[in-house]
Interface confidence: low
């Protein structure tokens, strides 16, 4: 009689909750951070002509006991974003990272001949949509 | 993605079998009785992140660009060995109303690992 029954999730390991009780959160909680980055900074400006810059998102923060509740449970059609992490695997610590399958491409205009001709391409897996303790 | 073979300590996929009985879920999952969930393990040295073939490659390349130059905020950002590809699995289970449901459940199996 909770979402967990009607939408089963995968347990990824045994040895439930191999952490000391009351382990404090080590860092700020896992969240997505935005940063404006120019292709010039990256040294890609000779290849990528437009846009000159883009909003880059990356995942940052720790995976302590409680993560803010703005991360929702998985429902069909939406990526799962876990809430209360406990490391279950021997020696494994959950890591704040982009959720698999949710990275998006960036559509760019490129040149390979110094600007005489242009192509429209996609830079795959550049934009982070969702972060989670994984 | 690499398979862990005991010879390498860089990020790889480790086989792991989960028994639903062992975690107390056999009262509502009818079949299967367990499955190979797998997990990711290993180190992520800076040259590994962003290697082509990884589904995180361009993203990791951008972060590494700044990380290797010691730029904030990326200087202290740790690269992690995480799932980069997951696979669904078909399951038979009881729902809230004790109805038997057969469903392909997303994200059940770790298929590939990579460095974030």
């Amino acid at each position: 009689s909770t979402p967990l029954m009607s939408w089963p999730w995968s347990p990824s390991a045994l040895r439930l909750l191999q952490r000391p009780p009351e382990e404090p959160a080590a860092h700020a909680n896992c969240h997505r951070v935005a940063l404006n980055i120019s292709f010039q900074e990256l040294g890609w400006e000779r290849w990528i002509v437009y846009p000159p810059s883009f909003i880059f998102h990356y995942c940052h923060g720790g995976c302590g006991l409680h993560i803010p509740p703005n991360l929702s449970l998985p429902v069909p059609g939406a990526p799962p974003t876990p809430a209360q992490p406990y490391s279950l695997l021997p020696g494994a610590q959950p890591c704040c990272a982009a959720l698999p399958g949710t990275m998006r491409p960036l559509h760019v205009r490129t040149t390979s001949d110094g600007g005489y001709s242009f192509k429209y391409e996609t830079v795959p897996n550049l934009l982070t949509q969702h972060c989670a303790c994984i | 993605g690499l398979e862990c073979d005991g010879k390498v300590n860089i990020c790889c996929k480790k086989q792991f079998f989960v028994s639903f009985k062992d975690i107390g879920w056999n009262d509502w999952i009818i079949a299967p009785s367990g499955y190979h969930a797998n997990y990711c393990e290993g180190e992520c040295p800076s040259h590994i992140a962003g290697t082509s073939g990884s589904s995180l490659s361009f993203h990791s390349t951008v972060i590494n660009h700044y990380r290797m130059r010691g730029h904030s905020p990326f200087a202290n950002l740790k690269s992690c060995c995480v799932p980069t590809k997951l696979r669904p699995m078909s399951m038979l289970y009881y729902d809230d109303g004790q109805n038997i449901i057969k469903k392909d459940i997303q994200n059940m199996i770790v298929e590939e690992c990579g460095c974030s």
Epitope: L4, W9, S10, P68, S72, A92, C133 | V110
Partner: antibody, heavy 126, light 108 residues
């Protein structure tokens, strides 16, 4: 059908320790957040804390310094101890289950309180 | 901690009428972590709604939940005599798990 039953003394003296036990019957004890919640007479509900069958705990910061929880040896009981009680601790004490799930990465998450005990009234008085 | 404020404190309605109960959070709560409970005198609370909008097993469809972020609503479409009780909202996404102070639905 999972059922919960609280047991323990109905009267505790001030400054003493309140001890209650919750017995779980008819279902699996593993993989859930076994919780204690209390309700002072005529007032609202207050979450005290939870324990997992492995012994991991989380408590309400307002009571943390006085609370301890443990799992019974038979693994179908969990208990609450609240030390240095005062009249303000007079309440109906409920045990409840918050069902849990595990995400694909081995992360346990809580659900709502789907099963409750009937509650036991504890009065703190000399 | 996340403080949940319920309004109104008391709702006086007649059987057959529609009841709308509000629960406001002091900070954003994922809708997946908000529940509603019904409590009658001398009884333990009973789970009505979990995940803000999903009905628990055996709960009649006149009960519905909605909302996201900081504002959540429990609606009882047509009040039955057995629905007069105290209703609590609760969040379980952030520790400490907290309850609202309750809304009493009484017969007018």
């Amino acid at each position: 059908q999972v059922q919960l039953q609280e047991s323990g003394p109905g009267l505790v003296k001030p400054s003493e320790t309140l001890s209650l036990t919750c017995t779980v019957s008819g279902g699996s004890f593993s993989s859930h957040f076994w919780s204690w919640i209390r309700q002072p007479p005529g007032k609202g509900l207050e979450w005290i804390g939870y324990i997992l069958y492995t012994g991991g705990t989380s408590f309400n910061p307002s009571l943390k310094s006085r609370v301890s929880m443990s799992v019974g040896t038979s693994k179908n009981q969990f208990s609450l101890k609240l030390s240095s009680v005062t009249a303000a601790d007079t309440a109906v004490y409920y045990c409840a289950r918050a069902r849990s799930g595990i995400t694909f990465t081995g992360i346990i998450v809580p659900g709502s309180f789907d099963i409750w005990g009937q509650g036991t009234m504890v009065t703190v008085s000399s | 901690e996340i403080v949940l404020t319920q309004s109104p404190g008391t709702l006086s309605l007649s059987p057959g009428e529609r009841a709308t109960l509000s629960c406001r959070a002091s900070q954003s709560v994922s809708s997946s972590y908000l529940a509603w409970y019904q409590q009658k005198p001398g009884q333990a609370p009973r789970l009505l709604i979990y995940g803000a909008s999903s009905r628990a097993t055996g709960i009649p469809d006149r009960f519905s939940g909605s909302g996201s972020g900081t504002d959540f609503t429990l609606t009882i479409s047509r009040l039955e005599p057995e629905d007069f009780a105290v209703y609590y909202c609760q969040q379980y996404g952030s520790s400490p798990w907290t309850f609202g102070q309750g809304t009493k639905v009484e017969i007018k």
